[in-house]
Interface confidence: low
Amino acid sequence: AIVFIKQPSSQDALQGRRALLRCEVEAPGLVHVYWLLDGAPVQDTERRFTQGSSLSFAAVDRLQDSGTFQCVARDDVTGEEARSANASFNIKWIEAGPVVLKHPASEAEIQPQTQVTLRCHIDGHPRPTYQWFRDGTPLSDGQSNNTVSSKERNLTLRPAGPEHSGLYSCCAHNAFGQACSSQNFTLSIADESFARVVLAPQDVIVARNEEAMFHCQFSAQPPPNLQWLFEDETPITNRSRPPHLRRATVFANGSLLLTQVRPRNAGVYRCIGQGQRGPPVILEATLHLAEIEDMPLFEPRVFTAGSEERVTCLPPKGLPEPSVWWEHAGVRLPTHGRVYQKGHELVLASIAESDAGVYTCHAANLAGQRRQDVNITVATVPTWLKKPQDSQLEEGKPGYLHCLTQATPKPTVVWYRNQMLISEDSRFEVFKNGTLRINNVEVYDGTWYRCVSSTPAGSIEAQARVQVLEKLKFTPPPQPQQCMEFDKEATVPCSATGREKPTIKWERADGSSLPEWVTDNAGTLHFARVTRDDAGNYTCIASNGPQGQIRAHVQLTVAVFITFKVEPERTTVYQGHTALLQCEAQGDPKPLIQWKGKDRILDPTKLGPRMHIFQNGSLVIHDVAPEDSGRYTCIAGNSCNIKHTEAPLYVVDKPVPEESEGPGSPPPYKMIQT
């Protein structure tokens, strides 16, 4: 037989909390246990499931777990079945809801002196106890003509008056817990004695010296008081006006009139209505003084015929916002057509040359009017007045190439030389009329030149060839003073160029003929063997038919070129001793000797007491020091040539004699001993 050791029993449970219905059986064979709810088998879910033979609830649900539970045990072998006693939950719960108007049927029907009933839709088990609040303050039974039933969920206001106006809320509690209304109810009952707005003042914008009117009206029973205040809380009445509001008038209907408005009158005006009861009602309005700023300047505009262009007029800052319109020749532009106004823009569709001229943007508001002109030019393609022509320009002189064009606007002219853009520098200058000036024409300026004249409408171009008329000149000019080495072969070149190849010849300056050992070979004067008599003045003459002749004078000097008789040698000297560096040179004219030591010329007048240069050119240095070491260069020069030779000077410490060295042993290097 199946015996229930533990049977489920009815019990209290809390909504959403855990619970357990126990069931334990004893039987000889295998027993299958399951549960019924109101006679129907219970299916396991994550929330409600069998645990052994008991039924476990993870979270009791007042809707799904209401009813009668029964534990059923069945012996699958014998078919015997036993059922437990019935068990159910007494589920405790509470759930928030809104405050709603129960009576009258709609808010529109609420009138002073009528009964108003509000219902608190908080539900629960066991039945909750309710508490009502107005504007957060608890209400008690019989308070200020309310009839409040705590047991019931209704709040009755009998009769309802303006003093009952406010935000109503409710809270409720029971054995489960507490909840407050999810949505509250605002009760608004008008009080005839409260000031109510009939007409509110509006912001106004007025021009200086004009008048401004603010309207303001309230209603109440009995009639309310009305007062005007200016920004600084100064009251405005017809009897006592503040100094800056001398021209203010308050009318019986509440309107405020300000005449001859000044900047100091601008600001916030407050109209205050006060009923017999209730708070003051404050209305604000601002008086703005109209203003308009200047308009920005327009840049002149250049357009091309046939195109569509727009010119935007930026309205000046102003209060109120200025209106904008365009005029041309004193006539306001239409809003459609070929030339028209669109918003703030001037639109020129398919521009014609006749559209050129002055267009005016106007802006105006209460404060006044502003205008700004824009000059519109319709560009034309340039036409020629004078094209550049092939020209012959003289070398060394300025040359001009003309490129004269006319168009609207004034064309821009650029020049190209061999397809390269000419940028203005010291040799090239482009005048305002387009003419190109080449300063100091050079042979290589002979090439192609092209000028391009442009406007936004298009460009024209033409080119011309420049031929440079070369001047007769020596290339290069002979040196005016030259030296020849005595008893040697010598040549003196002379060459020249011109429009025609020039003939070149040499002659002596005194007009005498050249000796037979001197030949003139195509401009080169050749001396087979220079003699003293060859010295003198010579003239190179270059000539051609069209340009005549030019002369270059050369003074030839015959000289014996410099040679060194004595050259300085590599020298080593003991510190504190005297060094002698010898140098002698010969030549005609007699050469002068200079010394260079350690990369600087030794000035004989600034040598100091330790150094001296002899007449024959030798350099002596007394009391030598290590810093005197270095390379010394002897430089010999005359009017015809210059030669140099160098030698190093070493300054060393005097060695202490060693015993191994015999007396009078020579030093290991060549010394000057003094």
């Epitope: 505009r301 821009t412 442009s454």
Partner: nanobody, 124 residues
Amino acid sequence: QVQLQESGGGLVQPGGSLTLACAASGFAFSSYAMRWVRQAPGKGLEGVSSISAGGDETYYADFAKGRFTISRDNAKNTLYLQLNSLKTEDTAMYYCAKGDRNSPRYSSWPITPVGQGTQVTVSS
């Protein structure tokens, strides 16, 4: 001394793209409108596009509209021209040019000084 150095040209097939750049020095680049001009073989200079000093206004010749884009980087003193959907008739030497301080739109073409130019060749 105003110096303008163009780069970025080259040989490209019809329908291809290139970006030209122009490095500017010797003047207050960010205060001036800038423009691109071009010269086709055997033809005169023609305006391509221009841009205001701040880069907020751009203008294009009819042939350039929808295909070319002008821009500038005032921090790098550099002007750019993006060439898309290139045609054989776009073959030309492209120069960048300094405009004036005011309108990028209405100054006359061409504007000097200009640089040495960069060659754009469109050929199949």
